[in-house]
């Protein structure tokens, strides 16, 4: 689940089994010149950043929930 910082794909691998309980925020990066794939980077309660698999049903659910809670705030 390493997160790189250069101008390229930031997610070198993704974490399996992520749980929404400790996710503070989610940043969804659309494909662009720096990276051809969608990247989902979660910031955890302890500040650590973790890459999630955008194709995972649970990750889609987490993103949807986060976006909805942002709208209602």
């Amino acid at each position: 689940a390493s997160v790189a910082t250069e101008l390229r794909c930031q997610c070198l691998q993704t974490l399996q089994g992520i749980h929404p309980k400790n996710i503070q925020s989610v940043n969804v990066k659309s494909p662009g010149p720096h990276c051809a794939q969608t990247e989902v980077i979660a910031t955890l309660k302890n500040g650590r950043k973790a890459c999630l698999n955008p194709a995972s049903p649970i990750v889609k659910k987490i993103i949807e929930k986060m976006l909805n809670s942002d709208k209602s705030n």
């Epitope: 689940a1 309980k21 979660a42 659910k61």
Partner: antibody
């Protein structure tokens, strides 16, 4: 390596209180939830609650709310569980267990602390 | 609270054989189930989390499957060191809840 070292066995009187400890080493104590789990003699495992040492946030099982308090001391990397108004129902082995940050699986456990409530 | 019904409560199997333990949740737990091995006098040991992901160091003889409310845990090629009590745990919703446990004995 990650280690959770719990305090020794306790023999206590009914109606009294007990405070058991769980000293963590080998990881950033403040950054991970610490869980507490109860096992009565011959019975299964029962989740009590958890504390996040970084900010003191807690979650309790409804059954244990009011029975005790979870605290954490960041300076000594030690989590504590205090149990009050003890009865024979509280005689059990109590375990602390670290919860991983991303998937909340309890990956490291203490060896357990036996509490016996007897007059 | 989510109830976890684990069965059987005990089972006896032969060395080299296979055993399967099941846990049924009272509602959908989104694959958030872990399985623990517990031996007397020790702390429980995480074997599998998120239904099927093996903890590092756990042999591939152990496996888990399931979705929704129904989950199972299997051990094949049973070895003497597998003698223990096994518990499922749901961690989809607080409070986390354990199944009642399955005591595994060797015939």
């Amino acid at each position: 390596q990650v280690q959770l070292q719990q305090s020794g066995a306790e023999l206590v009187r009914p109606g009294s209180s007990v405070k058991i400890s769980c000293k963590a080493s080998g990881y950033a104590f403040s950054d991970y939830w610490m869980n507490w789990v109860k096992q009565r003699p011959g019975q299964g495992l029962e989740w009590i609650g958890q504390i996040y040492p970084g900010d003191g946030d807690t979650n309790y099982s409804g059954k244990f709310k009011g029975k005790g308090t979870l605290t954490a001391d960041k300076s000594s990397s030690t989590a504590y569980m205090q149990l009050n108004s003890l009865t024979s129902e509280d005689s059990a082995v109590y375990f602390c267990a670290r919860e991983r940050d991303y998937d909340v699986a309890m990956d490291y456990w203490g060896q357990g602390t036996s509490v016996t409530v007897s007059s | 609270d989510i109830q976890m019904t684990q069965s059987p409560s005990s089972l006896s199997a032969s060395l080299g054989g296979k055993v399967t333990i099941t846990c049924k949740a009272s509602q959908d737990i989104n694959k958030y189930i872990a399985w623990f091995q517990h031996k007397p006098g020790k702390g429980p040991r995480l074997v599998i989390h998120y239904t099927s992901i093996l903890q590092p160091g756990i042999p591939s003889r152990f496996s888990g499957v399931g979705s929704g409310r129904d989950y199972s845990f299997s051990i094949r090629n049973l070895e003497p060191e597998d003698i223990a009590t096994y518990y499922c745990l749901q961690y989809d919703n607080l409070p986390w809840t354990f199944g009642g446990g399955t005591k595994l004995e060797i015939k």
